[in-house]
């Protein structure tokens, strides 16, 4: 028998420095977690003590904090090189700055293979990107070889900016021939490493013949066997075992997100490359693990540029700004209210005596809110804090939509409610009531909007044929998170100001903020 240790990360989202337990900015160092310096200590400890070790990343290193805002991916290449990653799969966020923003800082600088079998380049891009990412890579590990085959969510064109010259194929259809190719090369131990979410990971384990292990990402899935060590609730045991269509037991793993855990999976193979056993657990990277001094020194060196950029106080909050996915993807959250209020405030234009303002409404996808802000840091809010909340470098845009389109958008907001998906809308200038006992597409039972053509603003029922102005993220205007109806039906689209700047300006203007949850979004009795 031959034993392989797979160490894996996914959805690190620019958390190069240690963070608080909820993956926002580290406030009390003695209770902070993760970060590449701490990760390196653990990785080096395991590499020293165990014989056959691979360090893999399942995508979405890009995007999430000021590190990415400032360094744009150069930091990912540098520190992943320093940690000596063995391979990485492309995630959807690796395309957030377009293909060029992937090629120059990361693909050209990485000293490890970057993989995706289901992304096919065409047109002029094909020759430019050739060889910079691969469908698979065969890695020597001890006296054996291991094949790593990559995959990326086929939803990436809806989630990011890969442009028109990359085709995202169905994962299973694309993976099978690559795995078959590896088999013909006499590679009998194959890991599928990718970024399509836990449901697809399980499907790949079930459907792709020859895949021995699936290491995934995208859905921030936390798996654990036994008593979990922190706040995350396991979605299943680690590893999650899928019985493949050809009768094999295939371990599937994922390691939550934000570098809080290091996935640790031990696989035992027989001489024919069959998995005999698999066991392990994510390792919580808490403060009992010291930060590596060499990596930490490098982090501090790179930090200097960020400090100049980001550490000035913009204003104060006297309340917790709840930007957690557990809140903002399920119900009204005060972080959503704050951002929408800032968006409206940024668009105050008193150009007509008939109107108190030209726009009163804001919608914001809950999935775009990426971090909370703790008020217990003296209430201080910095650009850096906001960059963790709104890491995508988007803009808040002005669109004109018919009432019927807005109604469709709100139906879409809850069409698959409860799965922690990003399309759940936070709002401003809108009162919505949902009845989740009704079938998807018919769950909006009340939708009132704040009048604009009035001296005393009040809420009136939405009129299907009326044209409304709405402030929203450019992501939504472009049909992101499945809001195709907005993209297809908008009557006018004017691009606006940078998202973080809108919120920072508002906080600076207000000086002290205390946004509340105030009944903008309600669920009718008995259904929530």
């Amino acid at each position: 028998a031959w034993e392989l240790t797979i160490l894996h990360t996914n959805d690190v989202h620019s958390r190069l420095e240690q963070t608080s337990e909820d993956s926002s900015k580290c406030v009390n160092a003695s209770r902070c977690m993760g970060g590449v310096a701490r990760l390196f200590t653990k990785v080096q400890q395991i590499r020293r003590a165990e014989p056959n070790v691979l360090l893999l990343d399942a995508g979405d290193q890009y995007q999430g904090t000021i590190w990415f805002t400032v360094y744009k991916g150069a930091e990912v290449a540098h520190f992943m090189n320093a940690l000596r990653y063995d391979a990485m799969a492309l995630g959807n966020h690796e395309f957030d700055n377009g293909v060029e923003g992937l090629i120059e800082p990361l693909l050209k600088e990485a000293k490890f293979p970057i993989l995706s079998a289901n992304i096919k380049a065409k047109g002029p891009l094909a020759s430019q990107i050739s060889g910079l990412y691969l469908p698979y890579k065969v890695l020597p590990v001890g006296d054996e070889v291991v094949g790593i085959v990559g995959y990326t969510s086929k939803e990436t064109p809806f989630l990011s900016n890969p442009g028109t010259n990359l085709v995202f194929e169905d994962e299973i259809t694309a993976l099978q021939p690559e795995v078959d190719k590896l088999k013909t090369l006499n590679v009998n131990k194959i890991i599928a490493l990718g970024h399509s979410g836990f449901e697809m990971d399980k499907l790949i384990a079930q459907k792709v013949r020859g895949v021995d292990v699936v290491v995934g990402g995208h859905s921030n899935t936390f798996l654990y066997t036994g008593n979990p060590p922190s706040k995350e609730v396991p979605a299943g045991k680690y590893p999650f075992i899928v019985t493949s269509d050809d009768g094999r037991k295939v371990p599937v793993v994922q390691a939550y997100a934000f570098g809080k855990y290091l996935g640790y999976l031990k696989i035992e193979f027989d001489e024919r490359g069959n998995v005999i056993s698999s066991h392990g657990n994510p390792i919580l990277l808490n403060s009992s693990i010291p930060e590596d001094p060499s990596i930490k020194a490098d982090i501090n060196k790179w930090r200097i540029k960020l400090d100049n950029y980001s550490t000035q106080e913009l204003g104060k909050t006297i309340v917790y700004l709840d930007g957690s996915s557990q809140s903002c993807r399920f119900r009204e959250c005060n972080m959503g209210n704050l951002i929408c209020d800032a968006m409206i405030n940024n668009n105050l234009r008193h150009t007509d005596e008939m109107f108190w303002n030209h726009v009163s409404m804001c919608i914001l996808n809950g999935g775009g809110i990426r971090s909370p802000i703790d008020e217990r840091n003296n209430g201080t809010i910095t650009w850096e804090n906001l960059a963790a909340v709104l890491p995508f470098g988007g803009t808040f845009d002005l669109v004109q939509l018919k009432g019927s389109t807005l109604k469709k958008a709100f139906e879409h907001s809850v069409h698959r409610y409860g799965q922690s998906t990003g399309e759940f809308l936070q709002v401003g200038g809108i009162h919505v009531v949902y009845d989740l006992s009704r079938k998807p597409g018919d769950r909006v039972v009340k939708l009132d909007v704040l009048c604009t053509k009035c001296r005393v603003p009040s809420y009136d029922p939405l009129k299907m044929d009326e044209v409304y102005k709405v402030i929203l993220p450019n992501f939504l205007a472009n049909g992101g998170d499945g809001f195709q109806m907005i993209k297809d039906e908008l009557l006018r689209h004017d691009s606006g100001d940078q998202d973080i700047n809108v919120v920072s300006t508002y906080i600076s203007k207000m000086k002290v903020i205390y946004p509340a949850v105030e009944g903008r979004i309600k669920f009718s009795t008995g259904s929530h």
């Epitope: 200590t41 080096q44 400890q45 020293r48 003590a49 165990e50 014989p51 693990i289 010291p290 930060e291 590596d292 001094p293 060499s294 020194a297």
Partner: antibody, heavy 116, light 107 residues
């Protein structure tokens, strides 16, 4: 975590030195790296080698031809064997456990004299 | 092998005095350095790890500093209990190597 060295206090030149380290309060297969370190009469310290929780072994190249570190997981013990000893191997021998590269846990040491 | 040169090899200091012991590596060891205190007939005890981090249970009068090739251990106010021999260890590269030791005695 407690470590206790044991073995003969006197070894003849050209013979083999064999020492045992018994670990209590921690399984030697769960984690940590288990080291042998010696201290010569002039107080100079020398790292000799380790065996990890998974059985990986690393030796100081200066001793590589003479040293062997093994373990008995059922007894939670690890062992040092040093062959072809000379009077230069007279020292206090320590076993030590380390989690993150520095030696956090030490035995009390056992003195070995090489003499005919 | 990386050589660790410790100085002084012995020293006398008064109670309450600030004491500094230095360790120089023959190459950059990137702060992979720990400090140990050994009292007569006892085994060494970790004081500092990763050059600057105080080990659990170690009094705060002990501190470590340095980077690259040059490191130091400081006792801010010497106490009688600090009579011992102090060693540095580099664990950045195998084989791990110790400094020659500094014997500290009370004046």
């Amino acid at each position: 975590v407690q470590l206790q060295e044991s073995g003969p206090g006197l070894v003849k030149p050209s013979q083999s030195l064999s020492l045992t380290c018994t670990v209590t309060g921690h399984s030697i297969t769960s984690d940590y790296v288990w080291n042998w370190i010696r201290q010569f009469p002039g107080n100079k310290l020398e790292w000799m080698g380790y065996i990890s929780y998974s059985g990986i072994i690393k030796y100081n190249p200066s001793l590589k031809s003479r040293i062997s570190i093994t373990r008995d997981t059922s007894k939670n013990q690890f062992f040092l064997q040093l062959n072809s000893v000379t009077t230069e191997d007279t020292a206090t021998y320590y076993c030590a456990g380390d989690e993150y590269f520095w030696f956090a846990y030490w035995g009390q040491g056992t003195t070995v004299t090489v003499s005919s | 092998d990386i050589q660790m040169t410790q100085s002084p090899s012995s020293m006398y200091a008064s109670l309450g005095e600030r004491v500094t012991i230095t360790c120089k590596a023959s190459q950059d060891i990137k702060s992979y350095l720990s400090w140990y205190q050994q009292k007569p007939w006892k085994s060494p005890k970790t004081l500092i790890y990763y050059a600057t981090n105080l080990a659990d249970g170690v009094p705060s009068r002990f501190s470590g500093s340095g980077s690259g090739q040059d490191y130091s251990l400081t006792i801010s106010s010497l106490e009688s209990d600090d009579t011992a021999t102090y060693y540095c260890l580099q664990h950045g590269e195998s084989p791990y190597t110790f400094g020659g030791g500094t014997k500290l005695e009370i004046k």
